[in-house]
Interface confidence: medium
């Protein structure tokens, strides 16, 4: 059986909710019981079409409604003849999308105007990624390549911060993180040599 | 014309095996998969399970999964629905659906459209 | 197990839009189908493939899917449209089909 995958390059590029159809010539053969493989292990997907071409040459399809980032990988196709398995040339699916977080700020206690840092990464593709930060509704710096690291000189009460990723499918926002203000005993150092004043800020990521 | 033919209704009592079967013709009987689909009376459909082109590999719904048996004979182009032991509960009608498969032409996939009359299996005391 | 979650009925007047709805977490990854039953008949394919219109069925009918929704619409229902309706899709792995509970149309 001469096995190629028909109509799709080796690599393909699809935006994440949209749909896919990957195609699978069969010739050589009669009536061959094509299985579609993904990074190994066969794929259980009921929307498998089949076309007969002709008596020795099928058509198989694999159908995807809506890819997303879990559908990216290897695909190949395969059959079974005279006891051998003869496998296709794979297709590479890249499954495009607006950044997906791997980092997202987490919130902290600090006491007043102590520095602290949050942290942001998201990932592709598309590559690059960029970030930008908020506190609250003000944005305090960016874009950034991702990963990103804010460094914050102080905060004098509870503040919220969070972080945006862009690429060229768009943007994603992450969880808001919620920065809280550690109650400091009084008497303590903290107390005495820190003043109540506007927090200063301080974004080195930021900076030519 | 495709034509799924199935098998007279029967009764049965509890703990008796059965075997209903589903004829096609009309089409190629390697070119598509069989579904069986149950409809107790008065109540919804439920997919029970298909078997594939090749009657190499089946697949069953949860709720049947180990109750029932689907088979297929290619020489004759007949699905077949087992059970080794039946209950009261199986009371119900019975389709064979041709499913997956090829399409005519390449165009228009006209999987489970085409649908068998059904077979009433009544099981009782 | 994976469930498909439609009302159990939907009622309207002759010439008016009926809308059958058909819910489940799969649904954005999973094609939808519909099936009409009338009494004491087989089931027949309507819509296939979210919103595919299966040959033979006038064009009334109409399907669409958004998000976790499948929604089958009959624009102009008319009497002869009263049957059950039912949703079928397969579970997010791709393992096994599930119909809907159906929906029971009646045009009065």
């Known amino acids: 059986a001469g096995l190629k995958l028909m109509g799709a390059p080796v690599k393909l590029t699809v935006s994440q909710g949209q749909p896919v159809k990957l195609n699978c010539s069969v010739e050589g053969m009669e009536e061959p019981d094509i299985q579609w493989v993904k990074d190994g292990a066969v794929v259980q997907n009921l929307d498998q079409l089949y076309i007969p071409v002709s008596e020795q040459h099928w058509i198989g399809f694999l159908s995807l409604k809506s890819v997303e980032r879990s559908d990216a990988g290897r695909y190949w196709c395969q059959v079974e003849d005279g006891g051998e398995t003869e496998i296709s040339q794979p297709v590479w699916l890249t499954v495009e999308g607006v950044p997906f977080f791997t980092v997202e700020p987490k919130d902290l206690a600090v006491p007043p105007n102590a520095p602290f840092q949050l942290s942001c990464e998201a990932v592709g593709p598309p590559e690059p990624v960029t970030i930008v930060w908020w506190r609250g509704t003000t944005k305090i710096g960016g874009p950034a390549p991702s990963p990103s690291v804010l460094n914050v000189t102080g905060v004098t009460q509870s503040t919220m911060f969070s972080c945006e990723a862009h690429n060229l499918k768009g943007l994603a926002s992450s969880r808001t993180a919620t920065v809280h203000l550690q109650l400091v005993p009084r008497g303590s150092s903290a107390h005495h040599h820190h003043h109540h004043h506007h927090s200063a800020w301080s974004h080195p990521q930021f900076e030519k | 014309e495709v034509q799924l033919v199935q098998s007279g209704a029967d009764v049965k009592k509890p703990g008796a095996s059965l075997t209903i079967s589903c004829q096609a013709s009309?089409?190629?009987?390697?070119?598509?998969?069989i579904s069986w689909v149950r409809q107790k009376p008065g109540k919804g459909l439920e997919w029970m399970g298909q078997?594939?082109?090749?009657?190499?590999?089946?697949m069953y719904g949860p709720s049947f999964q180990g109750h029932v048996t689907i088979s297929a004979d290619r020489s004759t182009a007949t699905a077949y629905l087992q059970w080794r032991s039946l209950e009261a509960s199986d009371t119900a009608m019975y389709y064979c659906?041709?499913?997956?498969?090829?399409?005519?032409?390449?165009?228009?996939?006209?999987?489970?459209?085409?649908w068998g009359p059904g077979t009433l299996v009544t099981v009782s005391s | 197990s994976y469930e498909l979650t439609q009302p159990p009925s939907v009622s309207v007047s002759p010439g008016q839009t009926a809308r059958i709805t058909c819910s489940g977490d799969?649904?954005?990854?999973?094609?939808a189908y519909w099936y009409q039953q009338k009494s004491g008949q087989a089931p027949v394919l309507v819509i296939y493939?979210?919103?595919k219109r299966a040959s033979g069925i006038p064009e009334r009918f109409s399907g669409s899917s958004s998000g976790t929704m499948a929604t089958l619409t009959i624009s102009g229902a008319q009497v002869e449209d009263e049957a059950d309706y039912y949703c079928?899709?397969?579970?997010?792995?791709?393992?096994?089909?599930?119909f809907g509970g159906g929906t029971k149309l009646t045009v009065l």
């Open positions: 659906v041709r499913s997956g498969g090829a399409t005519s032409g390449g165009t228009i996939p006209e999987y489970y459209q085409h």
């Open positions: 009309g089409y190629t009987f390697t070119d598509y998969w």
């Open positions: 078997i594939n082109r090749h009657a190499s590999n089946t």
């Open positions: 799969a649904l954005p990854k999973k094609y």
């Open positions: 493939e979210d919103w």
């Open positions: 079928y899709s397969q579970e997010r792995k791709g393992n096994y089909f599930v």
